[in-house]
Amino acid sequence: ELCDDDPPEIPHATFKAMAYKEGTMLNCECKRGFRRIKSGSLYMLCTGNSSHSSWDNQCQCTSSATRNTTKQVTPQPEEQKERKTTEMQSPMQPVDQASLPGHCREPPPWENEATERIYHFVVGQMVYYQCVQGYRALHRGPAESVCKMTHGKTRWTQPQLICTGEMETSQFPGEEKPQASPEGRPESETSCLVTTTDFQIQTEMAATMETSIFTTEYQ
């Protein structure tokens, strides 16, 4: 089941999925001046069986100026640097990703892809939040969000994260600013069955990755 909404937005933070549950779809989009080849896929789909998951359909871009050709130009380093996504896409691949059953890794970049990747997540997907450069995290709970099914509707849990500018706080390192209640209903208000999958294993994975998943600087 696809999640109806996007993960919550946290001011001065970005999110990333460390692995993508089977059923996740990714827009096949090209950067300016390029377009999908006519017979090309609209979306990539994470699919697989119990032992192996991979992305079905390949995204292919061709120059808008040329006809009937799939000749592609390798992006220059400065073009690659300008890539940015709300999912904090990165070539970094945590090794733990591969061991999570029923999940796909971050798809490798395709030539001339758009600068932003748009994913369509499924129930059970977890994303992790990090403050952007120049801000630091104040949080009392997990800096992650999970897409859950509740009463037949999908929703994302609210990450317990506040990002504050370095100069905005007088606290000593490690001291937290008092935090207002997160937006949305507290979990305790949800009395009916909430179905999630592999929440525990992903939480464990997150804990083991905590010190390494966000080491790359995102511009």
Epitope: D5, D6, N27, E29, R36, L45
Partner: nanobody, 111 residues
């Protein structure tokens, strides 16, 4: 779940025009790549046109110059303007996004 509802099909004479609409609900429309497909009797479903989030269109060779795909993100709707229609354009036209299909709308081009 995404719901797609097509409308605008009908019977038209060769050389005539029709405008198909596909209204989408259930997801943020501006994140979706939308496609129009068609299936003629006894034939496989084929891609007619697609439009990306930013409005970049792609067309099948058979309709290029005659059909125009567009989108209105404020109305959660994608359109297919079909001009200079030919008998071979007769088919059921479907709207598609992600893994979801609309129910289809019949277009018949006949004199």
């Amino acid at each position: 779940e995404v719901q797609l509802v097509e409308s605008g099909g009908g019977l038209v004479q060769p050389g005539g025009s029709l405008r198909l609409s596909c209204a989408a609900s259930g997801r943020r429309f501006s994140t979706l790549i939308m496609g129009w497909y068609r299936q003629a009797p006894g034939k496989q479903r084929e891609l007619v046109a697609t439009i990306e989030r930013g409005g970049t269109p792609t067309y099948a060779d058979s309709v290029k110059g005659r059909f125009t795909i567009s989108r209105d993100n404020a109305k959660n709707t994608v359109y297919l303007q079909m001009n200079s229609l030919r008998p071979e354009d007769t088919a059921v036209y479907y709207c598609k996004t992600l893994r979801y299909w609309g129910q289809g709308t019949q277009v018949t081009v006949s004199s």
